[in-house]
């Protein structure tokens, strides 16, 4: 595989990762697919420092991150352990609220206007942030 040593055009480098900030919205799954087509993933927040960096760039706008509980427990899209990892939920969140009337609960996490996290309906068209790590082999699969 090949290694990425610098960030693509229009991406922002920070602490050996590259970040891309959308300027429009998509449902969580579509945002996830967008990042994957970029050989990236929805942002995974692992520290308060990273939280502040992302928050600075997105401003007071609802923005998807790579955290969901669509299959039961909360999971980060890159496999980072949720239970032992960094969290920044709003008070009384996540609450898997069913009162929105859209069917089901709330299975996808986003940054709220103050940067703290909330769970919401995954179909809502929020902005999103993609992240990819530098110096990580791209793991190009062998051709059969």
């Amino acid at each position: 595989g090949s290694e990425r040593t610098c960030c693509p055009v229009n991406w922002v480098e920070h602490e050996r990762s590259c970040y891309w900030f959308s300027r429009s919205g998509k449902a969580w799954a579509d945002a996830d697919n967008y990042c994957r087509l970029e050989d990236a993933h929805l942002v995974v927040v692992t520290s308060w420092e990273e939280q502040k960096f992302v928050q600075h760039h997105i401003g007071p706008v609802n923005t998807w991150m790579g955290l969901h509980d669509q299959n039961g427990p909360w999971k980060w899209v890159d496999g980072t352990d949720y239970e032992t990892g960094f969290k920044n939920w709003r008070p009384e969140q996540p609450d898997d609220w069913y009162g929105h009337g859209l069917g089901g609960g709330e299975d996808c996490a986003h940054f709220t206007d103050d940067g703290r996290w909330n769970d919401d309906v995954c179909q809502r068209p929020y902005r999103w942030v993609c992240e990819t790590e530098l110096d990580k082999a791209s793991q190009e699969p062998p051709l059969l």
């Epitope: 959308s22 429009s24 994957r36 050989d39 999103w128 699969p141």
Partner: antibody, heavy 122, light 106 residues
């Protein structure tokens, strides 16, 4: 100049297999996701499959999932579509197309190759 | 999948006419809408991306507008080379295309 050139089309019997190729030039191939889009004779356009620049992430239309496999060889600047268990309804011109994005999150297909015709018939 | 409905499926017009083609999405796609032109026996070429941005090299007589579910492609003054087929495509979700609009000489 960006160029895409498809090859590998032809006549195949139902249930048969075929592998299409798309040779790319004029851009840094490994930096771009690529797509296959098809068009049945006299019909509209249908997206078939996409693959990320590294080849690590792939996506398929429901109509071809489990039968078609998209892949790429970045050392050869070539995109592939392996088509198995072919059906009459897979008859179409198959185009490869480069994925282009804007700063906000939209993406589209530009440019497209000239296409290669796949005919599935007994 | 998001369904894209293009209308009309065909239209007749004359050189110099102003022509409008519409595209309606089955749900809001914000502005994730692209327009392509396809000439017989050729591959499609992008005209408009992100609903209203004109692709480099495309004549300014082509314009796009709309947001949410309803979009339009306008050709302000038809030229002989514009008599061909046009497609819309959404990229909010898994890509889907409209059925096409064939612009014919009246």
């Amino acid at each position: 100049e960006v160029q895409l050139l498809e090859s590998g089309g032809g006549l195949v019997q139902p249930g048969g297999s075929l592998r299409l190729s798309c040779a790319a030039s004029g851009f840094t191939f490994s930096s771009y996701a690529m797509n296959w889009v098809r068009q049945a004779p006299g019909k509209g356009l249908e997206w078939v499959s996409a693959i990320s620049g590294s080849g690590g992430n792939t996506f398929y239309a429901d109509s071809v999932k489990g039968r078609f496999t998209i892949s790429r060889d970045n050392s050869k600047n070539t995109l592939y579509l392996q088509m198995n268990s072919l059906r009459a309804e897979d008859t179409a011109v198959y185009y490869c197309a480069k994925r282009v994005t804007d700063y906000g999150g939209n993406d589209w297909f530009d440019p497209w190759g000239q296409g290669t015709l796949v005919t599935v018939s007994s | 999948d998001i369904q894209m409905t293009q209308s009309p499926s065909s239209l007749s017009a004359s050189v110099g006419d102003r022509v409008t083609i519409t595209c309606r999405a089955s749900q809001s796609i914000i502005n994730y809408l692209n327009w392509y032109q396809q000439k017989p026996g050729k591959a499609p070429k992008v005209l408009i991306y992100t609903a209203s941005s004109l692709q480099s090299g495309v004549p300014s007589r082509f314009s796009g507008s709309g947001s949410g579910t309803d979009f339009t492609l306008t050709i302000s003054s038809l030229q002989p080379e514009d008599f061909t087929t046009y497609y819309c495509q959404q990229s909010y979700s898994t890509p889907t295309f409209g059925g096409g609009t064939k612009v014919e000489i009246e």
